[in-house]
């Protein structure tokens, strides 16, 4: 057992069938001695009395809110969460498993440039009753400092019969190096609680792993002259860090219908211009990279070639 | 070239030689990009190898202010990759595939290292950690980390060099 | 299967014209841009221009504006090259490529030698 | 108009070889360069796109790497059906332009 924040503690537990629970101490925090009380949630069912109640923690009717009382009235709380470890893993019943990358990627995260600050989010099916609590660090063994928000929910979608919820957090590393080669990676944790089961989600990563520019802006087309040729020039993002001489990003200019099968005129350049040959109906598109590590690709940034 | 004394270097191919090092070293091995090595225990493999750090003067300001301290950063840093390319890590069992750009890439790291600091003029080199694997299989992890940290490194050159082609050539 | 048929062989004196077709056959003919490529005797490749089935547009290179023409007929599938004003230099194999892409050639005809003599 | 000059012209190689074959370009093309092998009498056949980028079909002996100006096609273990002339193509900026091709002999 062990205290996730004041008054709520966290009770580990392997998970099998007749599986013989954890014993648990609870301790009135009170000077009284004599005549105190245990409940269970909004029970009256008198569990023990004395300063300490001993129980046998085997599964989720265990756990909740225990209260010791005297004289009708409450001395203290303690809530009893469940961490279930199943076959040596610990439970991911909370999160929904988003598969990119990677298989059992519950977290995903994303910088717009390298000052420091990223965004992570995850997925969930359950839509009541869900707290979560986001720490994070550079760095474990002698963790610098990482300061993240509270997450909120950032969307929900209908999937087939079921609704998604996404929940996403913005953190800021302290002191953020800019332009440093990372050593340490950045570790996120996300403490996940549902009714009364605790889970725990982590994840690892360097900031130049997770870059995924903005868009390019500005996107302008310039017919030429006697040409089926088109000038299109656009500018850097501007949450892209800076200066661009310094943190540059290289660009892929694509023209193309509707439809993906359709065919199309594709240019990769270091510029902020390409010519490209723009077709009716057609629509000319950019997207930024940055220039000499291999992240992700921004969206793209579209105007229509008429 | 940059010397000792603090003459500049040829800022222009110093950045034409480390894009082309990225380029060789994510070619090297792409799929190196999606796998999660910090699983496996970096720590005693892949912390002793140079790190640009904060203080190296290899930011924008840094490098206005007397770019010698980051130009010796980074040749301490290709001295060392180059090296560790042409260790037993690289070479021995199993071995790279004839057309692996490991080669090129040794190569490339040695052309900007003399570019940086031509000979008689010598800056303090990092010592090379006794890193040899018994196991095929740990060296290939090995191969692994070291170039995707290899690919941190370089990308953070070619920032200074086309930063310094940019506004710092004469 | 993508593929690209050629017309046969062509002798013609100089100052006269050829054209030359270009049969594409297992896909969709205006899905892809046709280019034409000439192959002088033991010599590299020269791009000449390409054309968008789909409507026509055409664009050349520079060194063979007014000397080219491309078209395509949508209702047999077919690509055409026709040179003017033939000299002996214009002696050559001639490609027709396409691609779903513009700027490379993902798929080949056989070639079709042209050759200019009195 | 963007110049392509491929070298060697030609070389000599035996069958398992390693051979490569560079291309530079006049200006920066960034990756827009793509390789061609042609052997006599025969079309062209496209072997790698974008610099690097495989084509399905072609064997994995063919890579290419580069950016900007200089690039480089590389024949793992040389087959003897890999005998042939190999050619680079810029897609920068039209016109689009040829390398003067390398003939890879049997030596």
């Known amino acids: 057992i062990w205290e996730l924040k004041k008054d709520v503690y966290v009770v580990e537990l392997d998970w099998y069938p007749d599986a013989p629970g954890e014993m648990v101490v609870l301790t009135c925090d009170t000077p009284e001695e004599d005549g105190i009380t245990w409940t269970l949630d909004q029970s009256s069912e008198v569990l023990g009395s004395g300063k300490t109640l001993t129980i046998q923690v085997k599964e989720f009717g265990d756990a909740g809110q225990y209260t010791c009382h005297k004289g009708g009235e409450v001395l203290s709380h303690s809530l009893l969460l469940l961490h279930k470890k199943e076959d040596g893993i610990w439970s991911t019943d909370i999160l929904k498993d988003q598969k990119e990358p990677k298989n059992k990627t519950f977290l995903r995260c994303e910088a717009k440039n390298y000052s420091g600050r990223f965004t992570c989010w995850w997925l969930t099916t359950i839509s009541t009753d869900l707290t979560f609590s986001v720490k994070s660090s550079r760095g474990s063994s002698d963790p610098q400092g990482v300061t993240c928000g509270a997450a909120t929910l950032s969307a929900e979608r209908v999937r087939g019969d079921n609704k998604e919820y996404e929940y996403s957090v913005e953190c800021q590393e302290d002191s953020a190096c800019p332009a440093a080669e990372e050593s340490l990676p950045i570790e996120v944790m996300v403490d996940a609680v549902h009714k009364l089961k605790y889970e725990n989600y982590t994840s690892s990563f360097f900031i130049r792993d997770i870059i995924k520019p903005d868009p390019p802006k500005n996107l302008q087309l310039k017919p030429l002259k006697n040409s089926r040729q088109v000038e299109v020039s656009w500018e850097y993002p501007d949450t892209w860090s800076t200066p661009h001489s310094y943190f540059s990003l290289t660009f892929c200019v694509q023209v193309q219908g509707k439809s993906k099968r359709e065919k199309k005129d594709r240019v990769f350049t270091d510029k902020t211009s390409a010519t490209v040959i723009c077709r009716k109906n057609a629509s000319i598109s950019v997207r930024a990279q940055d220039r000499y590590y291999s992240s992700s690709w921004s969206e793209w940034a579209s105007v229509p070639c008429s | 070239r940059a010397v000792p004394g603090g003459s500049s270097p040829a800022w222009t191919q110093c950045q034409q030689l480390s894009q082309k090092l990225c380029t060789l070293a994510w070619s090297a091995h792409p799929l190196v990009g999606h796998m999660d090595l910090r699983e496996e225990g970096d720590e005693e493999t892949t912390n002793d190898v140079p790190h640009i750090q904060c203080g190296d003067g290899c930011d924008p300001q840094g490098l206005r202010d007397n770019s010698q301290f980051c130009l010796q950063r980074i040749h301490q840093g290709l001295i060392f990759y180059e090296k560790l390319l042409g260790s037993d890590i690289f070479t021995g069992e199993p071995s790279l595939l004839p057309d692996s750009p490991v080669g090129q890439l040794h190569a490339s790291l040695l052309g900007l290292s003399q570019l940086l600091q031509p000979e008689g003029h010598h800056w303090e080199t990092q010592q090379i950690p006794s890193l040899s694997p018994s196991q095929p299989w740990q060296r290939l992890l090995l191969r692994f980390k070291i170039l995707r940290s290899l690919q941190a490194f370089v990308a953070v050159a070619a920032r200074v060099f086309a930063h310094g082609a940019a506004t710092l050539s004469p | 299967e993508v593929q690209l048929v050629q017309s046969g062989a062509e002798v013609k004196k100089p100052g006269a014209t050829v054209k030359i077709s270009c049969k594409a056959s297992?896909?969709?003919?205006?899905?892809?841009?046709l280019h034409w490529v000439r192959q002088r005797p033991e010599k590299g490749l020269e791009w000449m221009g390409w054309?968008?089935?789909?409507?026509?547009?055409?664009e050349y290179a520079p060194k063979f504006q007014g000397k080219v023409t491309i078209t395509a007929d949508t209702s047999t599938d077919t690509g055409y090259l026709e040179l003017s004003s033939l000299r002996s230099e214009d002696t050559a194999v001639y490609y027709c490529?396409?691609?779903?892409?513009?700027?490379?050639?993902?798929?080949w005809g056989q070639g079709t030698l042209v050759t200019v003599s009195s | 108009d963007i110049q392509m000059t491929q070298s060697p012209s030609s070389v000599s190689a035996s069958v398992g070889d390693r051979v490569t074959i560079t291309c530079r370009a006049s200006?920066?093309?960034?990756?827009?360069l793509h390789w061609y092998q042609q052997k006599p009498g025969k079309a062209p056949k496209l072997l790698i796109k974008?610099?690097?980028q495989s084509i399905s079909g072609v064997p994995s002996r063919f890579s290419g790497s580069g950016s900007g100006t200089d690039f480089s096609l590389t024949i793992n273990s040389l087959q003897p059906e890999d005998f042939a002339t190999y050619y680079c193509?810029?897609?920068?900026?039209?016109?689009?332009?040829f390398g003067g091709g390398t003939k890879v002999e049997i030596k």
């Open positions: 193509q810029q897609s920068n900026s039209f016109p689009l332009t």
């Open positions: 974008f610099a690097s």
């Open positions: 297992g896909y969709t003919f205006s899905d892809y841009y």
């Open positions: 200006q920066s093309i960034s990756i827009n």
């Open positions: 490529a396409a691609n779903k892409e513009l700027r490379y050639f993902d798929v």
């Open positions: 054309i968008d089935p789909e409507n026509g547009d055409t």
